[in-house]
């Protein structure tokens, strides 16, 4: 009944020789207003574009079967850096983050994060400084004001500093991330740490007594056993995207959050292909209502740690790691020497009571089926702001289990699987390039997406 996610992004900065262009100053007070609905929506779209860029690259270079990252956490770390970035470095950061609004990005992001799903979402930021390193007062003030990042002085004793940082990370993520850093480079001048802890409760719980061992189809040939959560009449918003054909479902959490699952109907897909034509609007079509659905969703525990230097470099932020203009932080030159990110996610039935009345009312409607039993992508969105908090992909939810060869009669091979979609109504409303939305209708149709 509950989902837990803890991401953490660390920006590590070191000394750099001075070199220089003149500084740009944005007018004071211009960003202090609350974000308008239009700004919020624009930011959600920008964040979705950044998420697609970032995750496509991470997935391209990773050999892990399962991935999870928090684009919001990374964006917050970069926008914290943007507070002190100038000229070409600031411009580049804004462009990578798709932030047309520019100088107000840190203010907008931090403001929106303060309002995210109260109780479910905790943001903690902290800055560690080399003893005696001169940081500009303006940067310190804005950091504390926007990100609650009170500067903490490093002692210079590696062991103590490491222990202090890891202890703070552990507390900030409520014990979910135990050993974040294994070492600290000697030349560390500035560490920006960003921890987000998220705990979401399904709005409609899964009954643990229905959870059973089931097969997850890795490809046409192989399966792995998984613990599959089940619900007979789950109120679910779901639809089908075409070209490429992808089933999309919105599982609602309490606290205005959604777990959005994307299950491509073909096995031959890569993250870049799927994300290429995906936008915020594609995933949030109007006129798709909740309907009672037979649901199967695997229990999951995901944990992924990565250094994002190469990825951010490829994204267009090469200069952060070579010769950035960060003179808004200090007149002494700085260079980013590392960007560490870690997220964990737990998907299970355990948790709070279900909204039973809703389920009963909906059980009178016709039934369809949504089964997450093959590789999929997922997002976690905050529904009020539309911000993507997490993105991930699951190729094998049980990588430690031996793969099992499918028996021919059990196989939900694409032929059978696609056959089962034959009677599925086809919508012709286009969403973005090459993407069609296919909302489910009120009639019954063949068992959708479930292997026989």
């Amino acid at each position: 009944n509950q989902e837990q996610v803890s991401p953490l992004t660390l920006l590590k900065l070191g000394n750099q020789e001075p070199g220089g262009q003149t500084a740009l100053k944005s007018p004071p007070g211009v960003c202090s207003r609350d974000p308008t609905p239009e700004q919020t929506h624009r930011l959600a779209r920008a964040m979705m574009a950044f998420t697609a860029d970032l995750f496509s690259l991470v997935a391209q270079t990773s050999t892990c079967p399962n991935l999870i990252l928090s684009p919001l956490s990374v964006a917050l770390a970069l926008s914290h850096l943007a507070l002190g970035a100038q000229n070409h470095t600031l411009q580049r950061l804004q462009q990578v983050l798709h932030a047309g609004s520019g100088p107000c990005l840190p203010h907008l992001l931090s403001r929106l994060c303060q309002d995210l799903g109260p109780g479910a979402f905790r943001l903690a930021a902290r800055m560690y400084l080399q003893k005696g390193f001169p940081i500009k007062e303006d940067f310190l003030e804005q950091s504390e004001q926007l990100f609650g990042a009170k500067p903490v002085s490093l002692t210079g004793k590696q062991e103590d500093d490491l222990a202090n940082i890891n202890q703070w990370v552990k507390e900030a993520t409520e014990g979910k991330i135990q050993e974040f850093l294994s070492g600290l480079p000697e030349d560390t001048v500035l560490l920006l740490l960003n921890a987000i802890h998220f705990q979401g409760f399904w709005r409609n719980k899964f009954d643990p007594s229905l959870t059973q061992r089931d097969s997850f189809h890795l490809d046409e040939q192989f399966t792995v056993p998984v613990e599959m959560m089940q619900a007979r009449t789950y109120p679910l918003r779901w639809f089908l995207l075409e070209q490429p054909e992808i089933q999309v479902a919105h599982f609602p959490f309490k606290n205005n959050m959604s777990f959005v699952v994307l299950v491509p109907t073909h096995f031959e897909w890569n993250v870049s292909q799927v994300l290429a034509n995906l936008s915020w609007d594609t995933l949030h079509p109007p006129l798709v209502w909740e309907r009672p659905t037979k649901v199967r969703l695997p229990k999951l525990y995901l944990k992924h740690q990565m250094d994002l230097v190469a990825t951010l470099s490829q994204l267009g932020l090469q200069e952060l790691f070579q010769a950035p203009d960060l003179r808004g932080i200090s007149e002494q030159s700085l260079v980013v020497s590392g960007v560490q990110h870690q997220s964990t996610l737990e998907l299970s039935e355990v948790g709070v009571e279900a909204a039973a009345a809703t389920s009963i009312a909906m059980s009178r409607m016709s039934l369809s089926s949504f089964s997450v039993n093959r590789p999929f992508l997922f997002f976690i969105f905050e529904d009020t702001t539309g911000l993507p908090l997490f993105v991930g992909s699951v190729r094998n939810p049980n990588p430690s289990a031996p793969r099992e060869l499918k028996e021919q009669q059990d196989s939900p091979g694409n032929k059978d699987f696609l056959q089962s979609l034959k009677g599925f109504p086809r919508g012709d409303k286009l969403f973005g390039p090459d993407l069609k939305l296919v909302p489910p209708m009120e009639e019954d149709y063949p068992q959708f997406g479930s292997p026989k």
Epitope: E17, G19, H88, Q95, G316, A323, S337
Partner: antibody, heavy 119, light 107 residues
Framework: QIQLVQSGPELKKPGETVKISCKAS????????MNWVKQAPGKGLKWMGW????????TYAEEFKGRFAFSLETSASTANLQIKNLKNEDTATYFC????????????WGQGTSVTVSS | DIQMTQSPASLSASVGETVTITCRAS??????LAWYQQKQGKSPQLLVY???TLADGVPSRFSGSGSGTQFSLKINSLQPEDFGSHYC?????????FGGGTKLEIK
Amino acid sequence: QIQLVQSGPELKKPGETVKISCKASGYTFTNYGMNWVKQAPGKGLKWMGWINTKSGEPTYAEEFKGRFAFSLETSASTANLQIKNLKNEDTATYFCARWVPGTYAMDYWGQGTSVTVSS
Amino acid sequence: DIQMTQSPASLSASVGETVTITCRASGNIHNYLAWYQQKQGKSPQLLVYNAKTLADGVPSRFSGSGSGTQFSLKINSLQPEDFGSHYCQHFWTTPWTFGGGTKLEIK
């Protein structure tokens, strides 16, 4: 004045290894990224990748992953390109070129090193 | 990866004429484009960076323009030393690819 001086021409057999050097002078070596560019005879320029002269982190274009390696000798302000298991199609002139963060261009180039691979 | 398409591939012009070379990017590269000139047997030389800023020592008859996906290099009143190959290169996401080049010859 700023200069990038590359090592001399190389004649190699298929399967051998070659190492080309690029010595920088007249500026702070670690403040600027170093790029490598290939130009086959009569052809255009091909970006091979760059190396971060601060961290030593290389980035390779897809086509140049595997047999190609960028390295640094920071104390000597020198960047190196090594090509293993040479093939005939590696016959080309290889340029090093300095990348300037902020101006987004390669403002200074080495004179080029000609590598001929022939049995 | 962003592809750079340069046109024309070759061009014949006379001294004193004005020529324009274009470069199209397969995706938005903002203004992160540079132009180079290369003479036979020599290293390339930077002409223009950030799409329209002239590099030090480059004559004002050269000018760059464009942003997003469409860019051009214009040379007014061609001089004998302007002939050779001209290349564009983007500096957005890596790989930082070059265009195929334009060979500018004396008519």
